[in-house]
């Protein structure tokens, strides 16, 4: 079975980790693939290792574990996320987490960042 | 319409390395959503499950072959095949190669080569 | 290893019977057993996945039912190209194991 948190939130401008859980008592996994709607975003194979979609590279690391953590946040990154389990002899698992992009709690309380600098 | 084909020698002498061939026509093996099984059927007897291979070179097989069977994936010539080393007389079989699918939960051997009989003898 | 037990191991009937098949796993394998029917010199062909799902293009007179170790496949009117060997398969865990196969015959 798949195991993942459904719904979570995160800032505009922050990152996010997507994860999700896989138990079986008698599947092997092989693979695992990761996708923003139908886009891949990143695939996991035990034999060749990490693939990370060339336009997510800037933004997506892969791990922790067979999870990925999604950087650099932005409002269109709010979505459905999937991922996928090829797993012998059991099959195709499949998991799904809702991603909600919210505005940064600055931008939200209307505040201006300011970066200062040592002096002297 | 998926289609398998096994090519190999039909006559292996003891103590040699049987190698066998499945060529894949109306599909890619390179699918993610499939797996690939050698399977073999003694003359007059049932079916034992040799081994099965993603595309990515895991591989699955039966310990009573304990380390005798190798199964490599050639993705450029849509091909996996068989190697089993040290064979006797006990291996002289009906080779058959399969694709595990549909997409189900722990899916059965949905489309079939047609079987090659490989003998063992000197 | 899971041992797959078929009954009867061979059996004969007539055109127009209801034949009935049993499996038993040494364990619970869930609903992950299929059926296979091979005729002579012919490689086996899906008939049932997941105990009871009929594959795409077989005559719904095949049928099968049960879950966890017990398992049954079933004719219910019997024809003439059904005359063949069947098999039972688990696919829960790995060594993939088979029955020992029924062969319907002609009586």
């Known amino acids: 079975t798949i195991d993942t948190k459904r719904n979570i939130s995160a800032e505009e401008g922050g990152s996010v980790i997507l994860q999700c859980h896989f138990s079986s008592d008698t599947a092997e996994v092989t693979q695992v693939d990761w996708k923003q709607q139908d886009q891949l975003l990143a695939i996991y194979s035990v034999d060749l290792g990490w693939h990370v979609a060339s336009v997510f590279s800037d933004r997506v690391v892969p791990g922790p574990s067979l999870g990925l953590t999604f950087q650099s946040l932005t409002m269109n990154d709010t979505g459905e996320y999937f991922c996928t389990y090829h797993t012998y002899p059991g099959g195709i698992y499949k998991g799904r987490i809702f991603l909600k992009v919210q505005e940064s709690s600055d931008d939200r309380n209307g505040l201006a960042q300011f970066q200062t600098a040592p002096l002297g | 319409q998926l289609q398998l084909q096994e090519s190999g020698p039909g006559l292996v002498k003891p103590a040699e390395t049987l190698s066998l061939t499945c060529t894949v026509s109306?599909?890619?093996?390179?699918?993610?959503?499939?797996?690939w099984t050698w399977i073999r059927q003694p003359p007059g007897k049932g079916l034992e499950w040799i081994g099965t291979?993603?595309?990515?070179?895991?591989?699955f097989h039966n310990p009573s072959l304990k380390s005798r069977v190798t199964i490599p994936v050639d993705t450029s010539k849509n091909q996996f095949s068989l190697k089993l080393s040290s064979v006797t007389a006990a291996d002289t079989a009906v080779y058959y190669c399969a694709r595990v699918g549909p997409d189900v939960s722990h899916p059965p051997f949905d489309y079939w080569g047609q079987g090659t009989l490989v003998t063992v003898s000197s | 290893d899971i041992q797959m037990t078929q009954s009867p191991s061979s059996l004969s009937a007539s055109v127009g019977d209801r034949v009935t098949i049993t499996c038993r796993a040494s364990?619970?394998?869930?609903?992950?057993l299929n059926w296979y029917q091979q005729k002579p010199g012919k490689a086996p062909k899906l008939l049932i996945y997941a105990a009871s799902s009929l594959q795409s293009g077989v005559p719904s007179r095949f049928s099968g039912s049960g879950s966890g170790t017990d398992f049954t496949l079933t004719i219910s009117s019997l024809q003439p190209e059904d005359f063949a060997t069947y098999y039972c398969q688990q696919s829960y865990s790995t060594p993939i194991t088979f029955g020992g196969g029924t062969k319907v015959e002609i009586k």
């Open positions: 109306g599909g890619s093996i390179s699918s993610y959503d499939h797996y």
């Open positions: 364990q619970s394998i869930s609903s992950y």
């Open positions: 291979v993603y595309y990515s070179g895991s591989t």
